[in-house]
Interface confidence: low
Amino acid sequence: LQPGAEVPVVWAQEGAPAQLPCSPTIPLQDLSLLRRAGVTWQHQPDSGPPAAAPGHPLAPGPHPAAPSSWGPRPRRYTVLSVGPGGLRSGRLPLQPRVQLDERGRQRGDFSLWLRPARRADAGEYRAAVHLRDRALSCRLRLRLGQASMTASPPGSLRASDWVILNCSFSRPDRPASVHWFRNRGQGRVPVRESPHHHLAESFLFLPQVSPMDSGPWGCILTYRDGFNVSIMYNLTVLG
């Protein structure tokens, strides 16, 4: 990343796994460089942390008593460090939800996984990949959003009632595409425009529901940067 260049933004859904990508591409003269590579991930939490921050599971202790006791810019700390021999270190006990995909490393992928991502994980991340004679870096900003699906009117419906389902994710830009589906057995059946289903951006309008419409409905929001989120809602229609 060039000095002054914009830091790439990665979006993730609160409560879902998040991948913080880091796949530097370099000409390797010797495979041992990659096999013995070490990586260190650091996190600079967003300033003015959200309510969840005092209990930040990744932050170095001791935890402050109240958000106000954090400075305007929480200090950077090491989330995870994996040495050349595969030895790991970080804030102890090492959080099992913070992982490097070991199998991905055969593809030169040093991405950090948060399983799941939490609100307090938002902020700037830096990875340093240490090779024998050089170091490569990745830098990104993690933003977290909340996904929800609401029904209007809410609650149980009766046959012949109408309902509007609204699929949303707390991100400022609009999704590039919205796909609606129903779960049927092991598969997903796409919901298409029809007299029974009217699709408009992130809204699905069912003008006349029946007991057959009971069960899970889902939407997938896909954004221009490739981020997508799947949201489910269980509709109840009484006979």
Partner: antibody, heavy 121, light 107 residues
Framework: QVQLVQSGPELKKPGASVKVSCKAS????????MNWVRQAPGQGFEWMGI????????TYAEEFKGRFVFSLDTSVSTAYLQISSLKAEDTAVYFC??????????????WGQGTLVTVSS | DIQMTQSPSSLSASVGDRVTITCKAS??????VAWYQQKPGKSPKLLIY???YRYTGVPSRFSGSGSGTDFTFTISSLQPEDFATYYC?????????FGQGTKLEIK
């Protein structure tokens, strides 16, 4: 030393199937992906795709989607290429190629000796 | 896909000659170009990768240069064992693509 040994030449009739094997030795099989590359008679090379030996996940080049299947038997460190519904234009030498020393990039340093597949009626 | 155009397609030279082969990429591939040597009935051997890095064990008479779209492969002083077909390949992204080859023959 690191090497890939492929199965012998095959003569097949159009419409038949063939399975080419590629046995790896000298390194940990699941630590390097396996590529397949085709060289038609008197022609250059075409990259057919890759199979990640840790997950078994294949990726095929566009023109090799459909009749071509990559598979693995990690217990014997062997990768396989199966071609079904053979056509005369499938006649070529097929190479398995490990990017053993080049995992971050798409260049190839360990090649099998090649398997000639001839399709003729 | 990125196209690699190699020239010349064939070349006659004598032992001791300096030989140069060129390769042009259809788009910028930075320095991600490899060169291979193939002898009849054999598998290719990697000589050069990342435009100018010699692979392990490759003699110093083989060299490569270039960046962006234009690349050059040079044999500084031909030896009898160098008569073969040479291929360039871009390793900038998938799918990796090869040039059509340059057959180097004895004059």
């Amino acid at each position: 030393q690191v090497q890939l040994v492929q199965s012998g030449p095959e003569l097949k009739k159009p419409g038949a199937s063939v399975k080419v094997s590629c046995k790896a030795s000298g390194y940990t099989f699941t630590e390097s992906p396996m590529n397949w590359v085709r060289q038609a008679p008197g022609q250059g090379f075409e990259w057919m795709g890759i199979i990640y030996t840790d997950t078994g996940e294949p990726t095929y080049a566009e023109e090799f989607k459909g009749r071509f299947v990559f598979s693995l038997d990690t217990s014997v460190s062997t990768a396989y290429l199966q071609i079904s519904s053979l056509k005369a234009e499938d006649t070529a030498v097929y190479f398995c190629v490990s990017d053993y020393g080049s995992i971050l990039y798409w260049y190839f340093d360990v090649w099998g000796q090649g398997t000639l597949v001839t399709v003729s009626s | 896909d990125i196209q690699m155009t190699q020239s010349p397609s064939s070349l006659s030279a004598s032992v001791g000659d300096r030989v140069t082969i060129t390769c042009k990429a259809s788009q910028d591939v930075s320095t991600a170009v490899a060169w291979y040597q193939q002898k009849p009935g054999k598998s290719p051997k990697l000589l050069i990768y990342s435009a100018s890095y010699r692979y392990t064990g490759v003699p110093s008479r083989f060299s490569g240069s270039g960046s962006g779209t234009d690349f050059t492969f040079t044999i500084s002083s031909l030896q009898p064992e160098d008569f073969a077909t040479y291929y360039c390949q871009q390793h900038y992204n998938a799918p990796p693509t090869f040039g059509q080859g340059t057959k180097l023959e004895i004059k």
